[in-house]
């Protein structure tokens, strides 16, 4: 059974991930972002189901494309270089989902824009955090 300290750690990691995803979304939605139109052409894959930490596998598999999209944006839109930002997110995702369990992600048929994709994972983080508090 999860201890209160492990639950607290999970909650903090999810809050960190949530903040990173929100920061990316805000940077992309910045009205000064000249690359937004092109960014919206990138197709992202959404999980069929995302209710548990193991489902973060689906997010991990989209972090490569996410880094490429962020490379299009002006660096001043973000506090970190895309490579460093995604590296940080990868570390958090790996700790949350675990590296040993090989969960096969199932994707929804419909693809999404980067904005829809980020909103989906922001909602996921908020949902899990609410169950922990």
């Amino acid at each position: 059974a999860p201890t209160s300290s492990s639950t607290k750690k999970t909650q903090l990691q999810l809050e960190h991930l949530l903040l990173d995803l929100q920061m990316i979304l805000n940077g992309i939605n910045n009205y000064k972002n000249p690359k937004l139109t092109r960014m919206l052409t990138f197709k992202f894959y959404m999980p069929k189901k995302a209710t548990e930490l193991k489902h973060l596998q689906c997010l991990e598999e989209e972090l490569g494309p996410l880094e490429e999209v962020l490379n299009l944006a002006q660096s001043k839109n973000f506090h970190l270089r895309p490579r460093d930002l995604i590296s940080n997110i990868r570390v958090i995702v790996l700790e949350l989902k675990g590296s040993e369990t090989t969960f096969m992600c199932e994707y929804a048929d419909e693809t999404a824009t980067i904005v829809e994709f980020l909103n989906r994972w922001i909602t996921f983080c908020q949902s899990i955090i609410s169950t922990l508090t």
């Epitope: 092109r38 052409t41 990138f42 197709k43 894959y45 596998q57 991990e60 598999e61 490569g64 494309p65 490429e68 999209v69 490379n71 299009l72 790996l94 590296s99 096969m104 994707y107």
Partner: antibody, heavy 123, light 107 residues
């Protein structure tokens, strides 16, 4: 169906520069990141670098930085790879290949390849 | 840089047999691994992407699996046209790196 057609074989002397082309047909080049990979005779595959033809941003492998320049001409849907200060170890088949994030998950990998261009460096 | 180690270097089998090719990553790369087949004088051909997904037009006898940082390409029953060199490739971070290859030859 996307096709990549590369320029013909080249023979160069040590110290010279070679420029190889890769023409994309069946789609516009701006939909793809154009990557270059090489293979020395009887050896494995080695990633050189890539260009985003839409904004000309590039990434190069450390081994090639300073010697390689990847460019693209969107008006002709053609990518180029120029390698300077050639040495005998650069003798290899050079391939262009693609990645895109606009279509299916499969095309995020090296799904389309050119036929390869043999570059021979010999004095 | 991430190092991919393929084994064995050469695999000698007969048509109809099962082939198991291994690729080990020097660090965690998630599912960011693909497999390619290359025949003499030809460009590589994508077989498996995202560690386990079969590329379009590739026969179902090819399959990919992953356990941690160990990846496996399995050919369930070898056909004569399957004898070639196989490479794994990681897309987790640049520089993208390939394994040194496994040559699958007829016994």
């Amino acid at each position: 169906q996307v096709q990549l057609v590369q320029s013909g074989a080249e023979v160069k002397k040590p110290g010279a520069t070679v420029k190889i082309s890769c023409k994309v047909s069946g789609d516009t080049i701006t939909a793809y990141y154009m990557h270059w990979v090489r293979q020395a005779p009887g050896q494995g595959l080695e990633w050189i670098g890539r260009i985003d033809p839409d904004d000309d941003s590039t990434k190069y492998a450390e081994n090639f930085k300073g010697r390689v320049t990847i460019t693209a001409d969107t008006s002709t849907d053609t990518a180029y790879m120029e390698l300077s200060s050639l040495r005998s170890e650069d003798t290899a088949v050079y391939y262009c290949t693609t990645i895109t994030f606009l279509y299916t998950r499969e095309l995020r990998w090296f799904a389309y390849w050119g036929q390869g261009t043999l570059v021979t460096v010999s004095s | 840089d991430i190092v991919l180690t393929q084994s064995p270097a050469t695999l000698s089998l007969s048509p109809g047999e099962r082939a198991t090719l291994s690729c080990q990553a020097s660090q965690y790369i998630g599912n960011y691994l693909s497999w390619y087949q290359q025949k003499p004088g030809q460009a590589p051909r994508l077989l498996i992407y995202q560690a386990t997904s079969l590329a379009s037009g590739i026969p179902a006898r090819f399959s990919g699996s992953r356990s941690g940082t160990d990846f496996t390409l399995t050919i369930s029953s070898l056909e004569p046209e399957d004898f070639a060199v196989y490479y794994c490739l990681q897309h987790y971070s640049t520089p993208y790196t390939f394994g040194q290859g496994t040559k699958l030859e007829i016994k």
